[in-house]
Interface confidence: medium
Amino acid sequence: QPEQKASNLIGTYRHVDRATGQVLTCDKCPAGTYVSEHCTNTSLRVCSSCPVGTFTRHENGIEKCHDCSQPCPWPMIEKLPCAALTDRECTCPPGMFQSNATCAPHTVCPVGWGVRKKGTETEDVRCKQCARGTFSDVPSSVMKCKAYTDCLSQNLVVIKPGTKETDNVCGTLPSFSSSTSPSPGTAIFPRPEHMETHEVPSSTYVPKGMNSTESNSSASVRPKVLSSIQEGTVPDNTSSARGKEDVNKTLPNLQVVNHQQGPHHRHILKLLPSMEATGGEKSSTPIKGPKRGHPRQNLHKHFDINEH
């Protein structure tokens, strides 16, 4: 059913009456409608609601509503539905962000690193190396670095100091009468902390930009998402580096080397001399699906002198 509607601050548009050649000034139709009949010398203009699958965003003097963008391509989801007032807008699902017209998973900050800035639908996660007194013992795209457990507040002592990757291990003071036991809920990591390489068991989720490779040859892995690891510091477990982080360091080049150690394979991420990592600018504009209809519509982006 047609509707004669208009907005409160309605504008006007010019229309040439084909019958008389006269230039008429007609009231625009409101957003969500279009001009189904132009005004004449003897009638007001008539507005009709946009049919399903079409829209007009603004008051307008156009004769046909715009086609909505096509359904969101996987893995995108609808942020705004196609409706009389709005075009369909696509966005990335939770845990992903817009990258090159598709969605990429948020960067997983590696062990020893925490989330500095949460990821959004348009921006990747930004990671930072855990500062002194904090640690991150799990790869995560959502968790920040956690503060060390305060052993003293629990009337315990630090049996093993925390690192960027591990919490303090608390325990009672050693005595000859009883064996040392860590406090509940804490873990003891017996393996040496002073390793030149970061060992990542193959079952571990490897952060983007630290991908493993199946071949035996070395492969340089430097996708642009590494640019999301901010602060310019290098994941580093060496005791010499801890506590005096060099914020001017750029990201390392990473090489994945398959070492065979006994019956288990391990992916060892070696830090190579760094090259500057740069990242492309990420658009914050909503993603649209491709348009239906005449290709010229993309060119004009729905601009119509009678619509603005």
């Epitope: 509707e3 004669q4 509607k5 907005s7 009231d27 409101p30």
Partner: antibody
Amino acid sequence: EVQLLESGGGLVQPGGSLRLSCAASGFTFSEYTMHWVRQAPGKGLEWVSVISSSGGRTVYADSVKGRFTISRDNSKNTLYLQMNSLRAEDTAVYYCARDLSNYMDYWGQGTLVTVSS
Amino acid sequence: DIQMTQSPATLSLSPGERATLSCRASQTVSNYLAWYQQKPGQAPRLLIYDASNRATGIPARFSGSGSGTDFTLTISSLEPEDFAVYYCQQRSKWLSFGGGTKVEIK
């Protein structure tokens, strides 16, 4: 529910003035063109005037042109008809009506204007 | 101005009968024509717009036809509540109503 309620009618002497009001509710008044239509006792319907939703465009029937003024206050959801130089032939029930593509889809119950000495 | 002429002025019929009302324009109005129903003491009600489209909530027994200058409103089987006055209205050149047709019980 769409409702239109006219008021302001009454007895007036020829040459006198009267201002009719139409209070609208149940819809976004500022988005609709509105009409006044009248009906003389025992007679048919006669279209009087129309005003665009913004109030920017008004049109009148020849019989009232120059004497009647249609207006609206969108902040008050109210339509008005200022009637001057009233004549006996203006005696009628005056209806306000909401526009649907230059037809009328909702009507008030009307207010009676009697012009008599 | 466009004059609208309705005929007959009065139509006497019984419930269940078919009613055919006519409306003629003094010049072509394309299909820009509506039909209204008015009962005594009540405001008019829109039945048909653009010659043949039923307005919201109008029963299917009401139908409209015609274009140009000649139009017809048909009530396929009269119900007791259909006895009323019917008006046509054009919107081709501003707005004007016909004089009305009264449908009364015979």
